[in-house]
Amino acid sequence: QLPPGKPEIFKCRSPNKETFTCWWRPGTDGGLPTNYSLTYHREGETLMHECPDYITGGPNSCHFGKQYTSMWRTYIMMVNATNQMGSSFSDELYVDVTYIVQPDPPLELAVEVKQPEDRKPYLWIKWSPPTLIDLKTGWFTLLYEIRLKPEKAAEWEIHFAGQQTEFKILSLHPGQKYLVQVRCKPDHGYWSAWSPATFIQIPSDFTMNDEQKLISEEDLGGEQKLISEEDLHHHHHH
């Protein structure tokens, strides 16, 4: 029987800068029942606080509700593991809510094949920002990424859409059924999960000649460049 091993706070995430949750990994339990508590203070404070909510985020978590979440404040937190033989503490973690935002996926993904008579056919993709994000305040800039692939293909095509909430894609395989998904990230923060897939059947007559493929981006009203994983590196927050 031993004191508990050192716990580790491994992740903090906020869906919208208004609330956030942190999770820790317990160390070894030393063969005894172990209690965990998270304490924190804010930068510029020495007043120590205890986690206000150990329930909402699930096991080994601390949830900070609206009234506990301050923008522009760095939280300095640690986890204490205690059993009958003694205690151990995690390293301190510094958390700025601005940099831990991971939004919910975008909503209302709609995909449509457009075949105007006078113009080239294209796939039109439209979505809405996640509901928890209030873009009107100006606190947020959300960036979007689309991925799509034929149903049976292994590789995804990834398109970076910037701040737009709609996008047009030209080069598709006629007659194929495509899966389309979209995700978002704030300017500082983490990519959301991908939205649920939307399926779209591309008609067999969805064709264009080479001349039609060379269309300006302005003409399309959306960015068309197919971005490689390397190109995308600077859009991702690792």
């Epitope: 510029g44 404070e45 206000p52």
Partner: antibody
Framework: EVQLVESGGGLVQPGGSLRLSCAAS????????MNWVRQAPGKGLEWISY????????YYADSIKGRFTIYRDNARNSLYLQMNSLRAEDTAIYYC???????????WGQGTMVTVSS | DIQMTQSPSSLSASVGDRVTITCRAS??????LAWYQQKPGKVPKLLIY???TLQSGVPSRFSGGGSGTDFTLTISSLQPEDVATYYC?????????FGGGTKVEIK
């Protein structure tokens, strides 16, 4: 309705003891840090004690250290102040106050009067 | 311990006047400062926190300013219902010290 109601005040002789209670309702008491603040007749506000949500962190003002004990019972939604070795200068209205998430006293009780006199 | 000094200790002004109360911390406290209003015979009420953030429901004639060691509470146009004692309080560390208070009266 969010409410704090103090009780337990009264007249006590110097050197005596008293236990103040604060009953909370209308909010999740166990998620909030709580405090006692007092106000002597005609004087200003004096913070005297703080307790964290699960009771693991406690602070006292120097004026009461070693004589008063703050504790809480989250199952009963109650905060307590055990006051021993009371002095005349402890005569005051005692308020319990909820500390909001940004560390300010957002909810106050109506107060309970403690008079220490022989 | 950090001391909080308020001035003036009392003031008398006319309805509609602009009133400013100052609070000085003996050491820097960033903007961890709150202002409370206590009307005669009543419980204290939070007005402002983080030095300048107005608590919801508080009239916009109240405003706060300052950072570090020097802070102000301003009532832009004094109303009869503003007769009260005003307290500043620091909350960055224990003890959570209050200032001595400023009593505001109507001339």
């Amino acid at each position: 309705e969010v409410q704090l109601v103090e009780s337990g005040g009264g007249l006590v002789q110097p050197g005596g003891s008293l236990r103040l209670s604060c009953a909370a309702s209308g909010f999740t008491f166990s998620s909030y840090e709580m405090n006692w603040v007092r106000q002597a007749p005609g004087k200003g506000l004096e913070w005297i004690s703080y307790i964290s949500s699960r009771g693991g962190t406690i602070y006292y003002a120097d004026s009461i250290k070693g004589r008063f004990t703050i504790y809480r019972d989250n199952a009963r939604n109650s905060l307590y102040l055990q006051m021993n070795s009371l002095r005349a200068e402890d005569t005051a209205i005692y308020y319990c106050a909820r500390l909001s998430g940004v560390d300010i006293f957002d909810i106050w009780g109506q107060g309970t009067m403690v008079t220490v006199s022989s | 311990d950090i001391q909080m000094t308020q001035s003036p200790s009392s003031l008398s002004a006319s309805v509609g006047d602009r009133v400013t109360i100052t609070c000085r911390a003996s050491q820097g406290i960033s903007n961890y400062l709150a202002w409370y209003q206590q009307k005669p015979g009543k419980v204290p009420k939070l007005l402002i926190y983080f030095a300048s953030t107005l608590q919801s429901g508080v009239p916009s004639r109240f405003s706060g300013g300052g950072s570090g060691t020097d802070f102000t509470l301003t009532i832009s146009s004094l109303q009869p219902e503003d007769v009260a004692t005003y307290y500043c309080q620091r909350y960055n560390s224990a003890p959570l010290t209050f200032g001595g208070g400023t009593k505001v009266e109507i001339k």
